[in-house]
Every structure is written in C-alpha cells, then in structure tokens.
C-alpha cells in the first residue's frame, strides 16, 4: 500500500499532470501534451522527473523550477523554445537527463547549462542550431551521451568538444557537416559510438579520428565521401562501421588493418569497382561480407586471419579461379 | 607503462645507409603515429617524418624525402628509420616519439646517436 | 615551411622569479579554435619531455607552475616560480602542417 509520504507527495501534482511515486520517496510528474504554455507553479520540492514535453511552452524564465534540488531528469522536448536564458537551470543540481529535442533553438544554450556538474545526457537534436559555441559543454564534466543530430550544423564543433573526456556517444547525424579536420575528437578518449551519417561529408583529415581510442560504432552511411575512409586505421576497437551510400570507388589493401576487432561492414551502394586482395586480412571477428559489383576484382580475396565469416557474397567480378585454400580460411 | 626502447650508437661512413629500431611497449602499437626527431650536436630539434604503425601510411619531411624510409612492424610492435646516402651533417642523436594528443610527442625513445666520418 | 621563432634565446632567472618564453609562427597554426602549438622541456643528455600541448593544456604529471597561452601566431610558455630542477631548453613545436617544426630553443638558467 501506499505510505503516508506518497500521499503528502501526491498532493504536490499540478492539475491535469500525473504522478507517481518513484520508489524512492520522490514524485515522478508526467505534464506531457495538456497544451501548457507556461510552466506548472506548484511542483513539489521533492520532484525527481518532470515530463513537460509535447505543450507549447515558447520560453522559460530565469530560475522557473526554484528548489528541485532532486530533480533529476527535466523533459522540455517538442515545445516552441527558442531561447533558454542564464539561470534557467538554477539550482537542480542533481540533474542528469536534460531533453531539449524537437524545439527551435538556434544555438547551444551556453549560459543555461553551465554548471549542470550532474548531467550526463543532453538531448538537443531536431533543433535548428547552426552554431556551438567553443565553451558551451565546459562545465559538464560528468555529461555521457549527447545528441547534436538534425541541426544546421556545417562543421564540427572540435573547440566545444575538447571538455567532453567522458562522453561516450555523440550523434551529429543530419547536419550539414561537410569535412572532418585532424583532431576534431581528440579529447574524446572514452568515446564508443560516434554517429555521422547522412551528412554532407566529402573529406575528411589524415588523423581526424586520432584520440578516438575507445570508439567501437562509427557510422558514416550517407553522405559524400568518394574516396576510403583510411583515417579509421587509428581505432583499433572498432567493432562497427558504416559507410554505405557514399561514392567510394576502391577498398584499398590493408584497408582495415588497424581495426582488428571489426564485426560488422556496411558498405554496399557504393560504386565500388576495386577491392585489394589484402583489404579484409585479419579480421578474426568478421561475420558478414558482401562485395556487389565490384568488377575490377579478378582475385578472390586473400582472407588470411579472417577465420569466421559465416556469409560471403561476391558478385559481379571477374574471378576466373577459386585458391585451393578458399576452404582452408573459411569455417 | 608506455616505452620506446631504441637501437645503440652507430657509426657510418659517409655514403653509407643506417638503420635506427624503436620497440614500443605499453600501448596499442598500431593506434598511434611513431614520429622521427633528430638532433645535432648542440642544435635544436628537426623532424623527420612519420608513420601509422600497420598501414601504409607515412609523412615525411621534403628536405629528406629522397633519402628517408620509415617502416614498422606491427608483430613486434617495433619501427624503423633508414637514412641512406649519409653524410657528415646527418651526425646527430635521432629520436622516436609517439603522437599523442593532438599530435604532440607525449613519449620519446632514450635517442640513438649517428655519427658519421670518414 | 613554417618558422618557429623564440625569444630570447636564453635566459637567466632568480629562483622563485617568474620565466617567460616566446614563441612566433611564420603563419597561424590555429585550426578550428585549436592552436597546434606544443612545449618540450629538454634537459642535458636526455629526450625532450612534453610539458603543454594544444598552447594550453598542461600535461599529466607535469607540475602546475608550467602554463601556455596564446593564439594564432603568438604564444608563450611561463614557469610561474623557477625551480632548480626547471634548468634546460624549451622548444616550442607546431604540427598545424607538415613539415612539423621547432623552434630553436630557449636555454632557461638560474641567476
């Protein structure tokens, strides 16, 4: 049954929002989608979560949640925000969810979230934000996940990011990101998944995932690269990579010769024409590979070390002869 | 403990080609670039070139391009810089250094000193 | 190529004092907000050993009275009180492009 605490808690609710006990002794709000304008007043101190997502709030005030110091997760996702001003986060100090997604911010709200010491996810995706600037995130040294996708962004942000050592996955997905430069993650030393798909990518630098030592997921399916990507050699934990649907032509040799720990490829929808025969040596982990098309292969690939593949599809090449070792190196 | 353990004093004749050796422990060899570093008797610090430990990528400094190769070999987790056509201006104490963050030489080898006379 | 350029090319301070060291790049080697500008300290018969990189950011285990600052093309290293143990040369580095290059070294004494 209930405890004579939860029903102190209940009558803490706004109207219209419902609440529940979080097991903890501390209320779980839900004002989502009841068309609010404006914030609820009478939240009780003792609010843990705070679903005001899907209303029609256009702005927040200074301090408008005062003394929800065990606030710890605050959804304003899908209002009409498009400005969130210092001191809008005051005082929740045990803040570690912060959903900002689908509103119309046009940049990082710097000011707001600095010294959110707590927060460890921040959700600022399907917003228009076209700018970020070099020290927003640096007060937010406990901050793990953060989602910067569908925005307006046209580089990488490389001087914001320097203060995320503990982030450990970043979407930066539909942007309008056109190059990577050396280093634009050099910090992001616990980095494991790192999304960059349906950009604009045309380019990207020598060393530009130099730091990345941690990452395991990669994913830059969509977008203009037309030549491979080989900055990949430096993840040596890599476990997932995506670059389908861009316009490589060739798959170097030695191609992965850097990510031993690969399972899974996707590169098809690619014009590839040229794979070299050492491009997939040594990959003990790989299970899957399809090579469409490729019609300037008249080798069959040398897939020394490459011992588990479970599905091999080449078609669309000249391969006149199979090695007699081709049943040695597959399982 | 991250170490670049390199190759003992060599003494060449001019004309002649060296081999400097530069064995790392403690870290994820083909992860980060081995970058080359020479010092003249009382000079400053020149840089050679560099290379990603396993691929075949390598950098290096126009001025010794021609006469400069840098391999690696990743099963013994070891690099190498060869310097042929040598001459009485390449005696210095040359050095490996790991890439670190953002490129900065965060780990160097103890330095292996060439000399070369006639 | 670009020119790494420091000042003075020695330097005599009291111990406790503060040493101050320039370096001057030819050209900008800021790239997206960062300055591609490191520091190594080298003593007598030993490797150089990385003291800041990225202009600022001190390295792990390096003592905290070591800072860096500048940008673009100006920068400068201080020890904010000299210790014995701070006697060698100081080499800044740019790795904005290749070919990577140093500067000629400050030699920092004690008065």
């Known amino acids: 049954g209930s405890s004579p605490r939860s029903g102190v808690l209940l009558r803490g609710c706004p109207t219209h929002c419902h609440c529940e006990p979080d097991g903890r002794m501390l209320l779980r709000v839900d004002c989502s989608d009841l068309g609010l304008s404006e914030l609820p007043s009478n939240l009780s101190v003792f609010t843990s979560y705070l679903d005001l997502s899907m209303n029609n709030i256009s702005q927040l005030l200074p301090n408008p949640l005062p003394s929800l110091r065990f606030l710890e997760e605050l959804r304003l996702a899908g209002n009409a925000l498009t400005y969130i001003p210092k001191g809008a986060f005051t005082g929740l100090y045990s803040l570690k969810v912060l959903m900002l997604q689908n509103n119309q911010l046009r940049h990082v709200p710097t000011e707001a979230l600095q010294n959110l010491r707590s927060l460890q996810s921040l959700r600022l995706d399907a917003n228009h934000i076209s700018y970020v600037p070099p020290s927003c995130f640096s007060g937010l040294h406990s901050l793990r996940h953060l989602w910067l996708d569908d925005n307006a962004l046209t580089e990488i942000p490389v001087q914001a990011f320097r203060s995320l050592s503990a982030l450990q996955a970043m979407t930066l997905a539909l942007n309008k990101i056109h190059h990577i430069p050396d280093y634009a993650f050099g910090n992001l030393s616990s980095l494991v998944v790192l999304h960059l798909h349906n950009n604009r990518i045309h380019s990207l630098g020598k060393k530009c995932f130099d730091g990345l030592h941690s990452l395991e997921t990669l994913d830059l399916n969509y977008n203009n690269l037309d030549e491979f990507p080989t900055a990949i050699r430096t993840l040596s934990n890599l476990k997932e990579l995506g670059f389908h649907s861009n316009n490589i032509r060739s798959i170097p040799e030695k191609a992965f010769v850097g990510n031993p720990s690969l399972i899974t490829i996707h590169f098809y929808d690619n014009p590839i024409q040229f794979v070299g025969r050492s491009a997939f040596q040594h990959l003990p982990e790989l299970r899957t590979l399809t090579l469409n098309g490729a019609s300037q292969i008249t080798e069959f690939p040398d897939l020394t070390g490459t011992a588990n593949l479970e599905s091999l599809t080449l078609t669309g090449a000249q391969i006149s002869s199979l090695p007699q070792t081709v049943c040695n190196q597959l399982p | 403990e991250v170490q670049l353990v390199q190759s003992g004093a060599e003494v060449k004749k001019p004309g002649a080609s060296v081999k400097v050796s530069c064995k790392a422990s403690?870290?994820?060899?083909?992860?980060?670039?081995i970058e080359w570093v020479r010092q003249a008797p009382g000079q400053g610090l020149e840089w050679i070139g560099e290379?990603?430990?396993?691929?075949?990528?390598?950098d290096y400094n126009e001025k010794f391009k021609v006469r400069v190769t840098i391999t690696a070999d990743t099963s013994t987790s070891t690099a190498y810089l060869e310097l042929s056509s040598l001459r009485s201006e390449d005696t210095a104490v040359y050095y490996c250094?790991?890439?670190?963050?953002?490129?900065?030489?965060?780990?160097w080898g103890q330095g292996t000193l060439v000399t070369v006379s006639s | 190529d670009i020119v790494m350029t420091q000042s003075p090319d020695s330097l005599a301070v009291s111990l406790g004092e503060r040493a101050t060291i320039n370096c001057r790049a030819s050209e900008s080697v800021d790239n997206y907000g960062n300055s591609f500008m490191h520091w190594y300290q080298q003593k007598p018969g030993q490797p150089p050993k990385l003291l800041i990189y990225?202009?600022?950011n001190l390295e792990s285990g390096v003592p905290d009275r070591f800072s860096g600052s500048g940008s673009r093309t100006d920068f400068t290293l201080t020890i904010s009180s000299l210790q014995a143990e701070d006697v060698a040369v100081y080499y800044c580095?740019?790795?904005?492009?290749?070919?990577?290059?140093f500067g000629q070294g400050t030699k920092v004494e004690i008065k």
């Open positions: 580095q740019q790795n904005y492009e290749d070919p990577f290059t």
């Open positions: 403690g870290y994820t060899f083909s992860a980060y670039w």
């Open positions: 290379i990603l430990p396993g691929s075949d990528s390598t």
């Open positions: 250094a790991r890439g670190g963050h953002y490129g900065s030489l965060d780990y």
């Open positions: 990225l202009a600022s």
